[in-house]
Amino acid sequence: SGVFQLQLQEFINERGVLASGRPCEPGCRTFFRVCLKHFQAVVSPGPCTFGTVSTPVLGTNSFAVRDDSSGGGRNPLQLPFNFTWPGTFSLIIEAWHAPGDDLRPEALPPDALISKIAIQGSLAVGQNWLLDEQTSTLTRLRYSYRVICSDNYYGDNCSRLCKKRNDHFGHYVCQPDGNLSCLPGWTGEYCQQPICLSGCHEQNGYCSKPAECLCRPGWQGRLCNECIPHNGCRHGTCSTPWQCTCDEGWGGLFCDQDLNYCTHHSPCKNGATCSNSGQRSYTCTCRPGYTGVDCELELSECDSNPCRNGGSCKDQEDGYHCLCPPGYYGLHCEHSTLSCADSPCFNGGSCRERNQGANYACECPPNFTGSNCEKKVDRCTSNPCANGGQCLNRGPSRMCRCRPGFTGTYCELHVSDCARNPCAHGGTCHDLENGLMCTCPAGFSGRRCEVRTSIDACASSPCFNRATCYTDLSTDTFVCNCPYGFVGSRCEFPVGLPPSFPW
């Protein structure tokens, strides 16, 4: 589709005569008829196959034709066509005299013709005007012409329809040849595919508008290059979606089981050495002078009553010192300079000579002890606390502080390791002498039934097109990570099928 444009510039008819030679009365009121047709080697009468147009009266005898394209479009004359421009044409321009106001062919006498010119040739589509001048015996016509494409038509012969658009079916302008030129940020045959944010992962990201990066399931981050770990993963990471690879010191399905309580919590006080002994379990080895599960209790070395024979104990920074009563000496006042003659036995104790009177021994009544029966019986000396419990004197009574896993007055009762339901996923717990044992239901294993061993959802290779399969352990389902160019829950659909399907 295009327009053949003819611009009449000047007509000269100095004598004001018709083609017959007869003069016009009073002058030649001149108008033009134009016939555009297919190429003819010899231009002959017949249908104006490309179109026809007439002008009003433009002047009398000789005149210049005003460019009137802005005021109604009479000059240049427009001859539109709705076909592919063939590149060749024939043109007939007739100048007529109008005696009255009726310019219809049937209203004019045949001898009203002033002049007739006919040309033919090649003409390419373009903006440039071709200037021509045709002279007859009595007249001269100067004109120019060109062929341009109609709006939205492009190419050498105006055959390519192209309309710029900026909606979801295309974002482009039209090039002179009618090809599309994508607007910035768009690509594809019809410029409807956005160019994603630079660096947006080809497989894991996509976009619906330029410079965007939207993540496919299982991926996150500005460029969709960070995997999303398994839901509930506490102290772990992933290298592919839905994984939970535990950080050092953590275990379990969700990496929420503390395997390094010592490092994470530093429970041992006063410089004690901490040893991990299982999940959330530890043992503190106390430095001298400290006691307690966490070595939190400062131990007075005099608490064990090391001084004998009534010696008094004094705590010192590096230990203790015994102040011995008269008649005794030694680190613990264990050596006596007394004999039974000195009545050394207190609290009704009876004295017995030894080594020919060089030494003695006291036989103490109940509730008293010591080499001189000077001490009330320490109820802890018999070590009544079982299973490593710590005995503490509390005035007239005593009590046992039990190690983890034991209870009772004398720590004689073994706390059931099963009491806190350590077996996961419905496992059955059995108490053993040195701990516990879990009997796991089908589909689970491990010391605490924490390892899922159910049928791998990926075992059946459900993903197509070389996609990577991941098992979602919490739901026994699979997730397919598609390679570039494929989508769908199983990556079964190629992106960008051609418009016509083969089926």
Partner: antibody, heavy 121, light 106 residues
Framework: EVQLQESGPGLVKPSETLSLTCTVS??????????WGWIRQPPGKGLEWIGD???????YYNPSLKSRVTISVDTSKNQFSLKLSSVTAADTAVYYC?????????????WGQGTLVTVSS | SYELTQPPSVSVSPGQTASITCSGQ??????ASWYQQKPGQSPVLVIY???KRPSGIPERFSGSNSGDTATLTISGTQPMDEADYYC?????????FGYGTKVTVL
């Protein structure tokens, strides 16, 4: 040959939400060459474009319905859906799903057979 | 909002030419489509991108679009062409249908 089939309830109460699904067979909804849309036609009246969606999830809605419309796509099921909330009797219409072809300048070359939805208490 | 205006009805004798117009502001700068809908049936695309015919559509259907008006022409109209015809265009990202023209073959 691609085919589209609408499904959903034929009767919806006023103020409730109209929900329809379009199942695509004979072709992939994930093709980059197509958009998938909804058009409705009240009894005895003309066609009204509701909106459309790309397989990536990008949506485009009629401004006059935008506040009430949601169109979604499920590529794994080869389906797309329409939800229209707070319906009134004026939403009674035959609802069509259709495929818009990018290579045809956005013209709809395939339509479902349509489903009549009546809004009435 | 963008509007497309069509005459409500057009009557034509069998074998004659029916012309249906569709007017909208600068419609010639947009691609116009035409759909045919017979009673109780879904619409069928008969013209896309102003003047192109989908496969299976008879040659008697033709289209043009310039200025503010798109035209669907049915030359040698047949009784089977009696139907409602809708023009359609895209205004930015919004689909717009004309009000429809009922073509009656006398």
């Amino acid at each position: 040959e691609v085919q589209l089939q609408e499904s959903g309830p034929g009767l919806v109460k006023p103020s409730e939400t109209l929900s329809l699904t379009c199942t695509v067979s004979g072709g992939s909804i994930s093709s980059s060459s197509y958009y998938w849309g909804w058009i409705r036609q009240p009894p005895g009246k003309g066609l009204e474009w509701i909106g459309d969606i790309y397989y990536t999830g990008s949506t485009y809605y009629n401004p006059s319905l935008k506040s009430r419309v949601t169109i979604s796509v499920d590529t794994s099921k080869n389906q797309f859906s329409l939800k229209l909330s707070s319906v009134t009797a004026a939403d009674t219409a035959v609802y069509y799903c259709a495929r818009y072809d990018v290579s045809l300048g956005g013209s709809s070359d395939h339509w479902g057979q349509g489903t009549l939805v009546t809004v009435s208490s | 909002s963008y509007e497309l205006t069509q005459p409500p009805s057009v009557s034509v004798s069998p074998g004659q030419t029916a012309s249906i117009t569709c007017s909208g502001q600068r419609l010639g700068d947009k691609y116009a489509s035409w759909y045919q809908q017979k009673p109780g049936q879904s619409p069928v695309l008969v013209i896309y991108e102003d003047s192109k015919r989908p496969s299976g559509i008879p040659e008697r259907f033709s289209g043009s679009n310039s200025g503010d008006t798109a035209t669907l022409t049915i030359s040698g109209t047949q009784p089977m062409d009696e139907a409602d015809y809708y023009c359609q265009a895209w205004d930015r990202d919004t689909g717009v249908f004309g009000y429809g023209t009922k073509v009656t073959v006398l």
